[in-house]
């Protein structure tokens, strides 16, 4: 067990803070909730503290919760490939470019680390080149989320990892808005981290609303499990 992994044996409180600017529309989001890495489970609620969110909530899911991939459930035979937990408590910087097909792009930078006993994800997001009447600024996305796989490779040069994946957002007219994600994670501390073999995270997310909440908000339930590396031969013959 890596030293960081020991921090995830129980339920951990999570705080998410995002400051965003998309085509000059500035906004802030606060999110709170909890994660349980034993089950790869995340339960979070987000509110826009600046009024109405200028972009659809589903476009921010990867920035919020795929940001805290340290809550992914890594099966026993894959624990030596869990970069995310091994970087804790000092944490990691996560940078992404998210390119929306035939529309603009988000660039995000996040610091994910423990502050006391709380796992904090602080994010800055800049969005440019979006069409005012497009699927994103025109709020044409359905309020739901598809299952996805996040493909992870080691980045030995930077002592971190890279990830590439494509998100499929459902549009109200029945079509799909694609969002290409290019992700890089580097540790904040200088302690040893686990550099993984190629594998993927299987992610299932459910979006809902709080019937008592008057503010613009999103409730998120997510399950994430690592896969893609089989038991070694020594495991098979045990």
């Amino acid at each position: 067990m890596s030293k960081g992994e020991e921090l995830f044996t129980g339920v951990v409180p999570i705080l998410v803070e995002l400051d965003g600017d998309v085509n000059g529309h500035k906004f802030s989001v606060s999110g709170e909730g909890e994660g349980d890495a034993t089950y790869g489970k995340l339960t979070l609620k987000f509110i826009c503290t600046t009024g109405k969110l200028p972009v659809p909530w589903p476009t921010l899911v990867t920035t919020f919760s795929y940001g805290v991939q340290c809550f992914s459930r890594y099966p026993d035979h894959m624990k030596q490939h869990d970069f995310f937990k091994s970087a804790m408590p000092e944490g990691y910087v996560q940078e992404r470019t998210i390119s929306f097909k035939d529309d603009g792009n988000y660039k995000t930078r996040a610091e994910v680390k423990f502050e006391g006993d709380t796992l904090v994800n602080r994010i800055e997001l800049k969005g440019i080149d979006f069409k005012e009447d497009g699927n994103i600024l025109g709020h044409k996305l359905e309020y739901n989320y598809n299952s996805h796989n996040v493909y992870i490779t080691a980045d030995k040069q930077k002592n971190g990892i890279k990830a590439n994946f494509k998100i499929r957002h459902n549009i109200e007219d029945g079509s799909v808005q694609l969002a290409d994600h290019y992700q890089q994670n580097t540790p904040i501390g200088d302690g040893p981290v686990l550099l993984p073999d190629n594998h993927y995270l299987s992610t299932q997310s459910a979006l809902s609303k709080d019937p008592n909440e008057k503010r613009d908000h999103m409730v998120l339930l997510e399950f994430v499990t690592a896969a893609g590396i089989t038991h070694g031969m020594d495991e098979l013959y045990k």
């Epitope: 339920v11 951990v12 409180p13 999570i14 606060s30 709170e32 909890e34 609620k45 006391g116 709380t118």
Partner: nanobody
Framework: QVQLQESGGGSVQAGGSLRLSCVAS????????MYWYRQAPGKACELVSL???????TYADSVKGRFTISRDDAKNTVYLQMNSLEPEDTAVYYC?????????????????QGQGTQVTVSS
């Protein structure tokens, strides 16, 4: 779904006492910082008290020595014992759960908060 349900409000004479309760569901109560704040008509909302998971408490100067916050993690409940009540304590009282233990903080920014319970103190 996370729910916070306050109870125990009512009308009392100045100098009287009330005990507010807030039951939480849908969250792992023991890991959250629990707050009470209040909103009087036409006034800015005011943080009243905070209790963190280890039991450490913080109070607004206006209620120090009169109000006591406590928690029972087995019952997923936070309490506010209010003694020596004054007309200035009249407000709607809300409980809130947070993963951040900031004091002070804006009470409009709580992600998880209840619907409130009315406390009226008459002279």
């Amino acid at each position: 779904q996370v729910q916070l349900q306050e109870s125990g409000g009512g009308s009392v004479q100045a100098g009287g006492s009330l005990r507010l309760s807030c039951v939480a569901s849908g969250l792992t109560f023991s890991i959250y910082r629990m707050y009470w704040y209040r909103q009087a008509p036409g006034k800015a909302c005011e943080l009243v008290s905070l209790i963190i998971p280890d039991g450490t408490t913080t109070y607004a100067d206006s209620v120090k020595g009169r109000f006591t916050i406590s928690r029972d993690d087995a019952k997923n409940t936070v309490y506010l014992q209010m003694n020596s009540l004054e007309p200035e304590d009249t407000a709607v009282y809300y409980c809130a759960a947070s993963t951040a233990g900031n004091w002070p903080r804006a009470c409009t920014d709580f992600v998880y908060q209840g619907q409130g319970t009315q406390v009226t103190v008459s002279s």
